[in-house]
């Protein structure tokens, strides 16, 4: 099975690597522009140079290309707690990340928010916090895990999942209540 190619990929595949087909003359292969530059004018003929210009401030191209415009630099989303790890250069987009002791929660493919790593109070660290995953906690006896925090079994209601984990405590509470009424 041949993978489906778009028109641009079809045109490029006729030329050797690092070159592309002249849009007005399919017998000419022009050299692609280096990263950090963009296509200003196609090469006038075979063996002649493509006119490539450097990206202006605030834009970039990260790979060889024949784009008519550079791509706009991404901005880190402060409202999502993101910080700039490295600023945009002509050949590399801005790199955004989170502060120390934070992890990324991806809302969608290109959108993440920074959250503080759980400290596992009233529990122990089962798996350390990672770039894209919160700490995994194991709770001490008398506590259960709710939204990755160890909560006292005294906050466990019968309808919740915690009843299995807190069963001995619940039974003890019932026992003391019963003995108090006799």
């Amino acid at each position: 099975l041949v993978p489906h190619l778009g028109d641009r990929e079809k045109r490029d595949s006729v030329c050797p690597q690092g070159k592309y087909i002249h849009p007005q003359n399919n017998s000419i292969c022009c050299t692609k522009c280096h990263k950090g530059t963009y296509l200003y004018n196609d090469c006038p003929g075979p063996g002649q140079d493509t006119d490539c210009r450097e990206c202006e401030s605030g834009s970039f191209t990260a790979s060889e290309n024949h784009l008519r415009h550079c791509l706009s630099c991404s901005k880190c989303r402060k409202e999502m707690g993101q910080v700039e790890i490295s600023s945009c250069t002509v050949d590399r987009d801005t790199v955004c990340g989170c502060r120390k002791n934070q992890y990324r929660h991806y809302w969608s493919e290109n959108l993440f928010q920074c959250f503080n790593c759980s400290l596992c109070l009233n529990g122990t660290v089962h798996l350390s916090c990672q770039e894209k995953q919160n700490t995994v906690c194991t709770c001490h006896a008398g506590f259960f895990l709710r939204e990755n925090e160890c909560v006292s079994c005294s906050n466990c209601k019968k309808s919740l999942e915690c009843t299995k984990l807190c069963l001995p405590q619940i039974e003890n509470v019932k026992g003391t209540e019963d003995s108090g009424t006799t």
């Epitope: 929660h105 809302w107 969608s108 493919e109 290109n110 959250f115 939204e147 990755n148």
Partner: nanobody
């Protein structure tokens, strides 16, 4: 077919409260993060709040932090937005939206919207 149906909008006085609901159908609700987006008259779209499927992660715009609370009931396929201490600047059409897992757009489906008017 994905459907998102908002309700609960209306006219409220400054300082008042409203609770918006969004009934979702046509997809597995428990698999997707959901959100509320609003558009004030003559303004662009503003992200208001997001919530992930287990209700562990939430996002609030600075303009609504401490006043609005997002929640969801996965057993009822319903998303909520509790809005307290409403201000005139909260006047907008509020849209319930399904967050896209892939691609460059944050949302892939929207409801028709419900109008919230804050006025004395």
């Amino acid at each position: 077919e994905v459907q998102l149906l908002e309700s609960g909008g209306g006219l409220v006085q400054p300082g008042g409260s409203l609770r918006l609901s969004c009934a979702a159908s046509g997809f597995t609700f428990t698999r997707y993060s959901m959100g509320w987006v609003r558009q004030a008259p003559g303004k662009g779209l503003e992200w208001v709040s997001f919530i992930d499927p287990p209700s562990v992660h939430t996002y609030y715009a600075d303009s609504v932090k401490g006043r609005f609370t997002i929640s969801r009931d996965n057993s009822k396929n319903t998303l909520y937005l509790q809005m307290n201490s409403l201000r005139a600047e909260d006047t907008a059409v509020y849209y319930c939206a399904k967050i896209s897992q892939f691609g460059s757009n944050a949302f892939d489906y929207w409801g028709q919207g419900t109008l919230v008017t804050v006025s004395s």
